[in-house]
């Protein structure tokens, strides 16, 4: 029935990702400028650029990557949105000045191993957690 | 030595949160307006306002909350920042037009139980995961 279809649409909105029926929506900040949907972007970080070359021996840098893009209604399956993010997206639609859109953040992070000098000039090999973005989502 | 102190400062920057030596930083968007640091904000969501009152029986709404605020350098301990977020903050300082600041996102989410009508008008009690923001952090 129409009412059950309506319920299903509403339920889909809150509990699973929806099909994207339009673009990612316009930016809150830049007028009519369209931002791409939330996704992982490639980024190589050089430790020299961060000024860490004096204490990090290896690697010289690493593929850190980062997340960026819009989390606009409707959130599609690629956006790995939580139920809360879906609810927040709907509240943002009604009250954009009060509640921001969910933000595009890492959903999977990997570690890297770093060889560095400690304070006593000992060479240490250590694994640093949550250094590399593997996947992004709307949170 | 000075060099070891410098190394320690750098190391702290990438592997743990730093003490905040100034305010939360200025907003990217509005000139001199200061935005508060990333934190949890209270938000009650009414299912009627979302248009879900036809299929959700109870509760009438819930305290969903949301995350908002700046993730600016230096990231303090309250910001639950990942190592990647700390690196990204430093890269943003160097290249703000290319790499955004980390975003303020939920770090802890809770479930809620919802009583609703399914498509066959059966009354169902279901636990929906990740519906309530308990804590926020820079990601």
């Amino acid at each position: 029935s129409a009412s059950s279809r309506r319920r299903q649409q509403s339920r889909n909105r809150s509990t699973q990702s929806q099909d994207v029926s339009r673009g990612s929506g316009s930016s809150d900040y830049n007028g009519s400028e369209l931002k791409t949907a939330c996704k992982k972007h490639e980024l190589y970080v050089s430790f020299q650029d961060l000024g860490w070359q004096d204490w990090i021996i290896a690697p010289k840098g690493y593929a850190a990557n980062y997340c960026d893009g819009e989390c606009s209604f409707p959130l599609n399956a690629h956006m790995n949105a939580t139920n809360h993010a879906i609810v927040q997206t709907l509240v943002h639609l009604m009250n954009p000045e009060y509640v921001p859109k969910p933000c595009c953040a890492p959903t999977k992070l990997n570690a890297i191993s770093v060889l560095y000098f400690d304070d006593n000039s000992n060479v240490i090999l250590k694994k640093y957690r949550n250094m590399v973005v593997r996947a992004c989502g709307c949170h | 030595s000075a060099s070891s102190r410098r190394r320690q400062q750098s190391r702290n920057r990438s592997t743990q949160s730093q003490d905040v030596s100034r305010g939360s930083g200025s907003s990217d968007y509005n000139g001199s307006e200061l935005k508060t640091a990333c934190k949890k904000h209270e938000l009650y969501v009414s299912f009627q306002d979302l248009g879900w009152q036809d299929w959700i029986i109870a509760p009438k709404g819930y305290a969903a909350n949301y995350c908002d605020g700046e993730c600016s350098f230096p990231l303090n301990a309250h910001m639950n920042a990942t190592n990647h977020a700390i690196v990204q903050t430093l890269v943003h300082l160097m290249n703000p037009e290319y790499v955004p600041k980390p975003c303020c996102a939920p770090t802890k989410l809770n479930a809620i139980s919802v009583l609703y009508f399914d498509d066959n008008s059966n009354v169902i009690l279901k636990k929906y995961r990740n519906m309530v923001v308990r804590a926020c952090g820079c990601h």
Partner: antibody
Framework: EVQLVESGGGLVQPGGSLRLSCAAS????????MSWVRQAPGKGLEWVSA????????YYTDSVKGRFTMSRDNSKNTLYLQMNSLRAEDTAVYYC???????????WGQGTLVTVSS | EIVLTQSPGTLSLSPGEGATLSCRAS???????LAWYQQKPGQAPRLLIY???SRATGIPDRFSGSGSGTDFTLTISRLEPEDFVVYYC?????????FGGGTKVEIK
């Protein structure tokens, strides 16, 4: 009592600029979103722009994007509308209005007239 | 963008009569986000009804609102002399906040 008082209107040539102000009192200004709404002479109401309580998020109607900038100074309880590249069709009474969460505009200021003419 | 169409553009009635003003949305909207305003000449608009049917503070009970989906109505049960002014509906559920073109209630 909640009060909103607009100022800064006047006559300006096409292509010129003007800055409107709205002084707020009687409520915790920084807790509320605010909007500007305009009304051309003898015409209906048109929403122009909105801003979040912190000033971090702004929204504009398509016809003013890139020309108008809305801002606020919460320490002065004042709302602003910077209008650049003004056109004849921007001629209107400009009202500021408070918009509580999940609510319509209430109250409104008395308005300030902006006339764009050569 | 939700377009609101008000009808009639002008309503000619006598004091004491009832008035029915219509506001039609281009797509279904939540009644929670539909408002009505009254505007007297030379004055700012004043909020009458919010949430389609709730009267704002200080609004006389001769004003009532109803409707859902795409069709909303403002009813004035007995027109007083001060009611012969312009009325606007508004959708305030997200930007752009849109207004109807207005209905002028005039004395016949």
């Amino acid at each position: 009592e909640v009060q909103l008082v607009e100022s800064g209107g006047g006559l300006v040539q096409p292509g010129g600029s003007l800055r409107l102000s709205c002084a707020a009192s009687g409520f915790t200004f920084s807790s509320y979103a605010m909007s500007w709404v305009r009304q051309a002479p003898g015409k209906g109401l048109e929403w122009v722009s909105a801003i979040s309580g912190s000033g971090g998020r702004t929204y504009y109607t398509d016809s003013v994007k890139g020309r108008f900038t809305m801002s606020r100074d919460n320490s002065k309880n004042t709302l602003y509308l910077q209008m650049n590249s003004l056109r004849a069709e921007d001629t209107a009474v400009y009202y500021c209005a408070k918009r509580p969460y999940n609510s319509p505009f209430d109250p409104w200021g008395q308005g300030t007239l902006v006339t764009v003419s050569s | 963008e939700i377009v609101l169409t008000q009808s009639p553009g002008t309503l000619s009635l006598s004091p004491g009569e009832g008035a029915t003003l219509s506001c039609r949305a281009s797509q279904s909207v939540s009644s929670s986000y539909l408002a009505w305003y009254q505007q007297k000449p030379g004055q700012a608009p004043r909020l009458l009804i919010y949430g389609a049917s709730s009267r704002a503070t200080g609004i006389p009970d001769r004003f009532s609102g109803s409707g859902s989906g795409t069709d909303f109505t403002l009813t004035i049960s007995r027109l007083e002399p001060e009611d012969f002014v312009v009325y606007y509906c508004q959708h305030f559920g997200g930007t752009p906040f849109t207004f109807g073109g207005g209905t002028k209630v005039e004395i016949k």
